[in-house]
Amino acid sequence: SGLNDIFEAQKIEWHELPRWRQQWSGSGTTSRFPETVLARCVKYTEVHPEMRHVDCQSVWDAFKGAFISKYPCNITEEDYQPLVKLGTQTVPCNKTLLWSRIKDLAHQFTQVQRDMFTLEDMLLGYLADDLTWCGEFNTFEINYQSCPDWRKDCSNNPVSVFWKTVSRRFAETACGVVHVMLNGSRSKIFDKNSTFGSVEVHNLQPEKVQALEAWVIHGGREDSRDLCQDPTIKELESIISKRNIRFFCKNIYRPDKFLQCVKNPEDSSCLSGI
């Protein structure tokens, strides 16, 4: 009966009971995960004076508490709330940069344009960027062998729920003109199933956000198509407009030149097309 109560509380069906070491389809927790998170937290708080008050041990405890001892296919946004509270941070209006399927360029951009911020430039995003983690039900162990894959196993896994939670929060707190970098090389430039399309777009607050400006990044080869006329961009425009947020779109034909001109805006070649 007591065991039943535990499983009921975790909402796990009997057939879902984990074996001693659950085999998932995804790669296991990143090696030295606790040390990495702690070290990143210390580094971040040293570099960002406004976050110096943050106690990194408490951050790690809250992070750990979100997934340790929990069935890794049954994680909720609620599990991450203590961590979200500790990592509360605001971005100045007009300085939020969202991205979809083009992380590297977005990060290169904010490394140059230091007053703009992606989620990974914020404490929580910085802590978790490129890491994988999961625990096991009813043990205090971290699973370094395998973790649930979003497609093959379950969507409510520790990593996916984390990014959904912090992405939602990041979008909710954005204000002014919000920018988003989109990958023009993909068949779906705007993908409704991406984190941007499924979470961030729907959590921008019309009372705070005046406009969303999309930057469509042309790929390894410029072409003369106006990718802002792409049907998926029109779909994004429709979603945003229905939420009473204005929508603008720009083609970035040459990402290399774009970054160069962010670094050196006075360069004479920056007067012509990017």
Partner: antibody, heavy 116, light 110 residues
Amino acid sequence: QSVEESGGRLVTPGTPLTLTCTVSGFSLSNNAISWVRQAPGKGLQWIGSIYGSGNTYYATWAKGRFTVSKTSTTVDLKINSPTTEDTATYFCAREGAGSSWGFNLWGPGTLVTVSS
Amino acid sequence: AQVLTQTASSVSAAVGGTVTISCQSSESVYKNNYLSWYQQKPGQPLKCLIYSASTLASGVPSRFKGSGSGTQFTLTISDLESDDAATYYCAGGYSGNINGFGGGTEVVVK
């Protein structure tokens, strides 16, 4: 829709020459134009392209030797300092994009002869 | 620099026969399919036959077929007609907006 080259003539080595590609039936603001040449009895050689954005790209061998520019309805190819090796028929062609990549519209060509 | 090689400078076949022209690139073309084929006849503008490696240009008979991906491409002309006598060129598009042409292959119809 058409493209047509003009400006080809006999020039002496070192005398700059500008060829013009006049387009009709489509806009240069969302189309790319390439310049291609063919020496007598030889194959096709890509020189460079200009895109809707105004950005230009050149073959490695053509950098510095040629300059591509455009107005709203024309694309110019300037041969900065012609040599006898530049004797050829010069073509302009429209470049398709994305899932239909290729040079889908060609002009008849204009002949440039460089001789002293 | 990227090089497109058309190994045969000339191929011949009888009317009704089939010819195959190959085009090899020194590096992968952009998106593995930025490769097109052209027909050149004396005194006529160049004609695009195949774009994006395998898509038939409008008005081109289905006897012309393009295939291949990455670095190896082929143009096949079946049911050869005397009107197909011409020089055929491949063209490739590469990352960074560099383009190039193969050396050309003359098709002789006997």
